[in-house]
Interface confidence: medium
């Protein structure tokens, strides 16, 4: 190889870890970029090397694996911090190479501080619970691989700042937190603190996630089109602006793609020559049911446009529906002088 295959800075893997806590970071090369795993690479004689660039610097540095108490170490394809320090923040690179092959990727690592109530700049994962759906559990995330199965850690759960003890419908069960019946009042941030011993030292892992109580699949219905409907007629004269809202209600459905679209004479607006604009707005209820409104607009409608068929369509995982708007041309008011003349039989 005449050069190193450089996958650049993988900003999709913006890793955030808490200060003064252990962190284990897998080299992304084997997870996202190469078709073989670390064991295969190692047995083929390839060496995995780590280095980093400090925050606000552009000079690469080796990682010091000989710090007191082995604070930073490497084990197979994992970079370990026991524990992290604030100034470990930077871009880390793992490079796989031998004398003839080289491949590397960098990723950002941010060491963040938290306050006593676990507030921090950390981006929190969201766990959705169905409202009034029976027992549901959340699990303390990203703690695998930190300690062997022979080690029995202690786990403490918090809601916001408060330790979860004697809560009505929330019960800590080791790594799991059980919700007997999820209600809107259970919305919030939940933190597990895992404490475990290692080589005479005690380490803490703090993991916070956001719980969002959402609509239950038991109550889910196909999309409901509120507008257009049979009660509203869009009556316009040529030259006026035609505005037709399509308003659709979607029940919350996990991982469902909610879609709303218009057809004009059976075609998508992009596929026809008339000057149409579509504006969309979305709103959500407390349980994440969704209302989408798409307003179809023709600035200066023609008599031809008023003869067309305008249909609003909606689709979710629960089904597909459609509704035509009632559009007609306004009959012009009679011209008064002509009517009078005719009425009196003028010749």
């Amino acid at each position: 190889s005449e050069r190193c295959d450089d996958w650049g800075l993988d900003t999709m893997r913006q890793i955030q870890v808490f200060e003064d806590e252990p962190a284990r970071i897998k080299c992304p090369l084997f997870e996202h970029f190469l078709k073989f795993n670390y064991s295969t690479a190692h047995s083929a004689g390839l060496t995995l090397i780590w280095y980093w660039t400090r925050q606000d610097r552009d000079l690469e540095e080796p990682i010091n694996f000989r710090l007191p108490e082995n604070r930073i170490s490497k084990e197979k394809d994992v970079l370990w911090f026991r524990p992290t320090l604030l100034n470990d923040t930077g871009n880390y690179t793992c490079m796989l190479r031998n004398t003839t092959y080289c491949s590397k990727v960098a990723f950002p690592l941010e060491v963040v501080q938290k306050d006593s109530c676990f507030n921090s700049p950390m981006k929190l994962p969201v766990h959705k619970l169905y409202i009034e759906y029976g027992i549901q559990r959340i699990t303390c995330p990203n703690v695998d691989g930190y300690f062997p199965s022979s080690v029995k850690p202690t786990i403490t759960w918090y809601m916001g700042c408060y330790k979860i003890q004697n809560f009505n419908n929330v019960i800590p069960e080791g790594m799991n937190l059980s919700f007997l019946i999820a209600l809107i009042s259970n919305n919030g941030n939940y933190t597990c603190v895992v404490t475990y011993p290692e080589n005479g030292r005690t380490f803490h892992l703090t993991r916070t996630l956001t719980v969002k109580v959402v609509g239950s699949p038991k109550n889910a219905v196909p999309p409901v089109i509120h507008s257009p409907n049979d009660h509203v007629v869009y009556e316009k004269e040529p030259g006026e602006e035609l505005l037709i809202p399509c308003t659709v209600y979607f029940s919350f459905l996990m991982d469902s793609r909610n879609e709303v679209w218009w057809t004009i004479d059976g075609k998508k607006p992009d596929d026809i020559t008339i000057d149409v604009t579509i504006n969309e707005s979305i709103s959500h209820s407390r349980t994440e049911d969704e209302t989408r409104t798409q307003i179809l607009s023709i600035k200066k409608v023609t008599s031809e446009d008023l003869k067309r068929s305008y249909v609003c369509h909606a689709r979710s995982a629960k089904g597909e529906v459609a509704k035509a708007a009632k559009v007609k041309q306004k009959v012009p008011a009679p011209r008064y002088t002509v009517e009078l003349a005719c009425g009196f039989g003028a010749t």
């Epitope: 050069r3 190193c4 280095y51 400090r54 610097r57 010091n64 190479r97 004398t99 080289c102 590397k104």
Partner: antibody, heavy 119, light 113 residues
């Protein structure tokens, strides 16, 4: 492997270029350096070049030596104006201490050296 | 620039004995220190890197230790083939283009009786 060449007897002030030819690996992947050893004396680092081409020199060597890569397998050390104090065996070294060689934290591959005599 | 002071300049030890070589940096170099062995007419050979990591194929009789400014190379159960000159080498100014450099200690000659 590394093989140095170009060492010979030169008169003071006559520029001299030493060449290091590498085999089994590419200079685009590894950092390289030059270390010298005067007869009966210790080791002295002259400078290094990263895989990306950045050069670093010992304070005393700046302006007196130039390190460059002439291909993916050859590395040059130019002694711009040799003096009698530059009489030494010159070793070409490979840095494995740090990935793309910007910092030579250690040298684990050495050439046999080439002798330069300035007289 | 950082100066590496290596002591002693020469040491003599019978086979089976223990040799201790010290290297002192004029300022902290964290653990960016290596040890080399050089026999007459040969290039140096890497023994230890990052202060205490044993290079590939090197006998475990060689032990490196230290951090900051004080470093030690210990050769336990000295063998006749250990007769050589030993050098420490540091890397300093890591993370800085302008201050970056490499320095060697003056060397320690080990004679095995």
């Amino acid at each position: 492997s590394l093989e140095e060449s170009g060492g010979r007897l030169v008169t003071p002030g006559t520029p001299l270029t030493l060449t290091c030819t590498v085999s089994g690996f590419s200079l685009s992947i590894y950092g390289m350096g030059w270390v010298r050893q005067a007869p009966g004396e210790g080791l002295e680092w002259i400078g290094s070049i990263s895989s990306g081409g950045s050069t670093y020199y010992a304070t005393w060597a700046k302006g007196r030596f130039t390190i460059s890569k002439t291909s993916s397998t050859t590395l040059d050390l130019k002694i711009t104006s040799p003096t009698t104090e530059d009489t030494a065996t010159y070793f070409c070294v490979r840095s494995d201490g740090y990935t793309n060689g910007d910092y030579d934290t250690y040298f684990n591959l050495w050439g046999q050296g080439t002798l330069v005599t300035v007289s | 620039d950082i100066v590496m002071t290596q002591t002693p300049a020469s040491v003599s030890e019978p086979v089976g004995g223990t040799v201790t070589i010290r290297c002192q940096a004029s300022q902290s170099i964290s653990s960016w220190l290596s040890w080399y062995q050089q026999k007459p007419g040969q290039p140096p050979k890497l023994l230890i890197y990052q202060a205490s990591a044993l290079a590939s194929g090197v006998s475990s009789r060689f032990i490196g230790s230290g951090y900051g400014t004080e470093f030690t190379l210990t050769i336990s159960g000295v063998q006749s083939e250990d007769a050589a000159t030993y050098y420490c080498q540091c890397t300093y100014g890591i993370g800085s283009n302008s201050d970056y450099g490499v320095a060697f200690g003056g060397g320690t000659e080990v004679v095995v009786k």
